[in-house]
Interface confidence: low
């Protein structure tokens, strides 16, 4: 009796959909695995008799509702299937946007780029998929715990009326307004403000 793969899960970030599993405890080491997805009420092989412990399902339609499954095999024997249900547009993890910061006097000018999508033309980002896409910005004075938040549907934002000559740390995440669904935060970037007073030359 072949035991099934263990810890089967879909790890999907920005529509890069990787089914992952672990090799079951079994005395023979040359197990292989077959992973399938359900399409038009029948299952299609996608990764067949692979020794790998993952299978890339990024080709699936973003709006489909799928059952994906994997089993272990040895020669003519095989385990039971392990099923995972998956809807890419609902289940994918929204990765962190990219952010550029420019310090101008007592303000910080932010520019955002939404995460790019796997298996799509180069210019496609998550904004092309989610109509209610917005950016949630969180910022705080370096060394303090008080945090402030701004939500912007635009690719840029200006944080005004900041303290001069002060370092602020900023991070951003994607945010779907209609679902109250949040993405991953970017790593904080810390930038120092200037001063808008005119200094004598």
């Amino acid at each position: 009796m072949i035991p099934p793969p263990e810890k089967v899960r879909m790890n999907s970030v920005n529509f890069k959909n990787i089914l992952q599993w672990e090799v079951p405890a079994f005395p023979k080491t040359n197990l292989t695995f077959t992973a399938q997805y359900e399409s038009y009420r029948s299952f299609q092989d996608h990764c067949k008799r692979t020794a790998s412990t993952q299978c890339d399902f990024s080709h699936l339609s973003k709006y489909g509702d799928y059952t994906v499954r994997v089993r272990a095999e040895l020669a003519d024997e095989h385990s039971e299937w392990v099923n995972v249900t998956f809807c890419p547009v609902e289940d994918t993890i929204i990765g962190p946007p990219e952010m550029q910061i420019e310090s101008l006097a007592e303000s910080l000018h932010l520019r955002f780029s939404a995460p790019q999508i796997e298996n799509e033309p180069e210019t496609w980002t998550l904004k092309n998929i989610y109509d209610s896409w917005a950016y949630r910005v969180q910022y705080w004075k370096n060394g303090t715990n008080e945090k402030f938040q701004v939500v912007s549907p635009y690719d840029s934002e200006v944080l005004r009326n900041l303290e001069p000559w002060t370092t602020y740390c900023i991070q951003v995440q994607g945010f779907l307004l209609d679902q109250n669904r949040t993405g991953e935060w970017s790593e904080p970037i810390c930038e120092r403000t200037g001063n808008d007073e005119i200094t004598p030359s």
Epitope: C87, D91, I93
Partner: nanobody, 126 residues
Framework: QVQLQESGGGSVQAGGSLRLSCTAS????????MAWIRQAPGSEREVVAT????????YYADSVKGRFTISQDNAKNTMYLQMNGLKPEDTAMYYC???????????????????WGQGTQVTVSS
């Protein structure tokens, strides 16, 4: 590296209460999924309570429903587990765990949570 630190464990009589705290580093505190997981000696790990950190959803294991309450304070990067009506079978090491996002319609399995604290011991005597 993400750090999670539990506190609040201890020894208590059956029927008593404890409040566990889990403080997260800045980078995980506002991510989407945090949970309390316990493991008694010789037993499997059990996900006892989960919170989606936007506050939209909580999940509880049947064994603790009505007795335990999970909550959070994003401003303090902290999650809590209020444990009332404690029973001897609640004796275990309690771990705080977190990850980027909870599954859409269920609590996470323990192996889906990548970031873990060191644990805090809870002992309930009869």
């Amino acid at each position: 590296q993400v750090q999670l630190q539990e506190s609040g464990g201890g020894s208590v009589q059956a029927g008593g209460s404890l409040r566990l705290s889990c403080t997260a580093s800045r980078y995980i505190a506002l991510n989407a999924c945090m949970a309390w997981i316990r493991q008694a000696p010789g037993s499997e790990r059990e996900v006892v309570a989960t919170i989606v950190t936007d506050g939209s959803r909580t999940y509880y294991a049947d064994s603790v429903k009505g007795r335990f309450t999970i909550s959070q304070d994003n401003a303090k990067n902290t999650m809590y587990l209020q444990m009332n009506g404690l029973k001897p079978e609640d004796t275990a090491m309690y771990y705080c765990a977190a990850d980027r996002r909870c599954p859409v319609s269920r609590a996470p399995y323990e192996y889906e949570l990548r970031y873990w604290g060191q644990g805090t011991q809870v002992t309930v005597s009869s």
